[in-house]
Interface confidence: low
């Protein structure tokens, strides 16, 4: 990769809210249709997980099109405001420990563990295999390590110092990486390839964090996740440089990354991804 357009950027983790689609049309690309009108409409962007503006041509298109931002939000996002509960004593835990269990929209029925903020314990639940949220762990031990309090009210292990805990919080699929490294690129680079909800067969690339390489996969045309690139080069640019050597806790992490606004073409949408 050419490095001439890179700069040093301070990396901070950003967390996407849980995504649960009540309708899979929320995963459709924004479709302006064949007509030539200029009408301001809103669509749900599955990658940014937000309702965004687009220009509609006035005819055809698809159902992921709303007259107002409010209508879009009502149809395609769930109100998470009362799902995330934080108290002063709980600040040590990552925010996602306070999310409700979320099986996602698929039907894989995989046994996983989540932190139940009511019982203050990690409990078993059935995960569908896609989407959902980060309160989702492969083992009871990992869940306890990250979200449960120790006997004196503090964390059993500090989130952020345990590599596997970090990885598992980023991807429910629990992609392990060599223990001398931490991943501080976009969290979606750690997610597994996800074909999505539709029936197309488009050639795409995803970043395989186990082997540290971009690999091809077949994309269905809608849904899926952000680990989805139209070229191997785009995939490498977005994800390859995220691995850095571990440093002592508390230090600012600096690593070479792309410019502040890196244009990444993901699935149908072109979105601007702020460096994480």
């Amino acid at each position: 990769d050419s490095e001439e357009d890179e700069e040093h950027t301070i990396i901070t983790d950003t967390e996407l809210p849980p995504l649960k689609l009540m309708h899979s049309f929320c995963a459709f690309k924004a479709d302006d249709g064949p007509c030539k009108a200029i009408m301001k409409r809103f669509f749900f962007n599955i990658f940014t997980r937000q309702c965004e503006e687009f220009i509609y041509g006035g005819c055809e298109g698809n159902q992921n099109r709303f007259e107002s931002l409010e209508e879009c939000k009502k149809m395609c996002t769930r109100d998470n405001a009362n799902r995330i509960i934080k108290t002063t004593l709980q600040q040590e835990k990552p925010d996602f420990c306070f999310l409700e269990e979320d099986p996602g929209i698929c039907r894989g029925y995989i046994t996983r563990y989540f932190y139940n903020n009511q019982t203050k314990q990690c409990e078993r639940f059935k995960y569908g295999g896609c989407l959902g949220n980060m309160n989702n762990f492969e083992t009871l031990e990992e869940c306890k390590n990250i979200c449960e309090d120790g006997p004196n009210g503090f964390q059993v292990d500090n989130y952020g110092t345990q590599l596997n805990a970090v990885n598992n919080s980023l991807t429910p699929q629990s992609t392990k990486v060599p223990s001398l490294f931490e991943f501080h690129g976009p969290s979606w680079c750690l997610t597994p390839a996800d074909r999505g909800l539709c029936r197309a067969n488009e050639n795409r690339f995803y970043y395989n964090s186990v082997i540290g390489k971009c690999r091809p996969f077949k994309y269905s045309g809608c849904g899926g996740n952000e680990n989805n690139f139209t070229s191997k080069q785009e995939c490498l640019r977005a994800c390859k440089k995220g691995f850095i050597q571990r440093i002592s806790k508390g230090g600012l992490i600096k690593t070479k990354r792309k410019r502040k606004k890196q244009r990444v073409k993901i699935a149908y949408e072109e979105i601007f991804v702020k460096n994480m």
Epitope: H23, S24, F25, E60, R107, C198
Partner: antibody
Framework: EVQLVESGGGLVQPGGSLRLSCAAS????????LDWVRQAPGKGLEWVAD????????LYNQKFKGRATISRDNAKNSLYLQMNSLRAEDTAVYYC????????????WGQGTLVTVSS | DIVMTQSHKFMSTSVGDRVSITCKAS??????VAWYQQKPGQSPRLLIY???TRHTGVPDRFTGCGSGTDYTLTISSVQAEDLALYYC?????????FGGGTKLEMK
């Protein structure tokens, strides 16, 4: 076992109103959207409206917007359809159907309730 | 609105025959098509969704295929209990619309 049971059909005068109900059981009510679909005697199926039980967000067939109101009561696991200004052509069997977001299709249907609009 | 056209209102068949019921959309519906079966006096039953995925419990003699505007439901070996009305439906955009139905009857 998923069950959807409609009620509230019957004979209505033209210009009148009626409220159909659908009692859902056998699954978590807020996990799936619910729809109303109607079928005129000897005719095909016609989608009327859809509701997301979690936030009450609705989708309507524009043909019925203004005359039809879909609603739900999560505490009662019930779906409703209020139809106003009824006409003879509204005579149909009205079905309540569970809309499965993964499939984007209606995977369970009630037995239907017949609405007859006649003077 | 998207119009779903089932060109054959009736199709005659015999037990053991292979039969294909077609459905044409007035615009590309991107495989967002479901097929339903309705027997006399009964409510519709979901057979196929996303054009080709069989719903739970549906016998494997039922298959769906298609893309763009053209979709087909095929019954590989018709059984007596398959005699019914078959509807296609697009769920690409609202209003969700159904085809007029194809009635499968015995020769």
């Amino acid at each position: 076992e998923v069950q959807l049971v409609e009620s509230g059909g019957g004979l209505v005068q033209p210009g009148g109103s009626l409220r159909l109900s659908c009692a859902a059981s056998g699954y978590t009510f807020t996990d799936y959207n619910l729809d109303w679909v109607r079928q005129a005697p000897g005719k095909g199926l016609e989608w009327v409206a859809d509701i997301n039980p979690i936030n009450g967000a609705t989708l309507y067939n524009q043909k019925f917007k203004g005359r039809a109101t879909i609603s739900r009561d999560n505490a009662k696991n019930s779906l409703y359809l209020q139809m106003n200004s009824l006409r003879a052509e509204d005579t149909a069997v009205y079905y309540c159907a569970r809309y499965y977001g993964d499939y984007d299709a209606m995977d369970y249907w009630g037995q239907g309730t017949l609405v007859t609009v006649s003077s | 609105d998207i119009v779903m056209t089932q060109s054959h209102k009736f199709m005659s068949t015999s037990v053991g025959d292979r039969v294909s019921i077609t459905c044409k959309a007035s615009q590309d519906v991107h495989t967002a098509v479901a097929w339903y079966q309705q027997k006399p006096g009964q409510s519709p039953r979901l057979l196929i969704y996303w054009a080709s995925t069989r719903h739970t419990g549906v016998p494997d003699r039922f298959t769906g295929c298609g893309s763009g505007t053209d979709y087909t439901l095929t019954i590989s070996s018709v059984q007596a209990e398959d005699l019914a009305l078959y509807y296609c439906q697009q769920h690409y955009t609202t209003p969700y619309t159904f085809g007029g139905g194809t009635k499968l009857e015995m020769k």
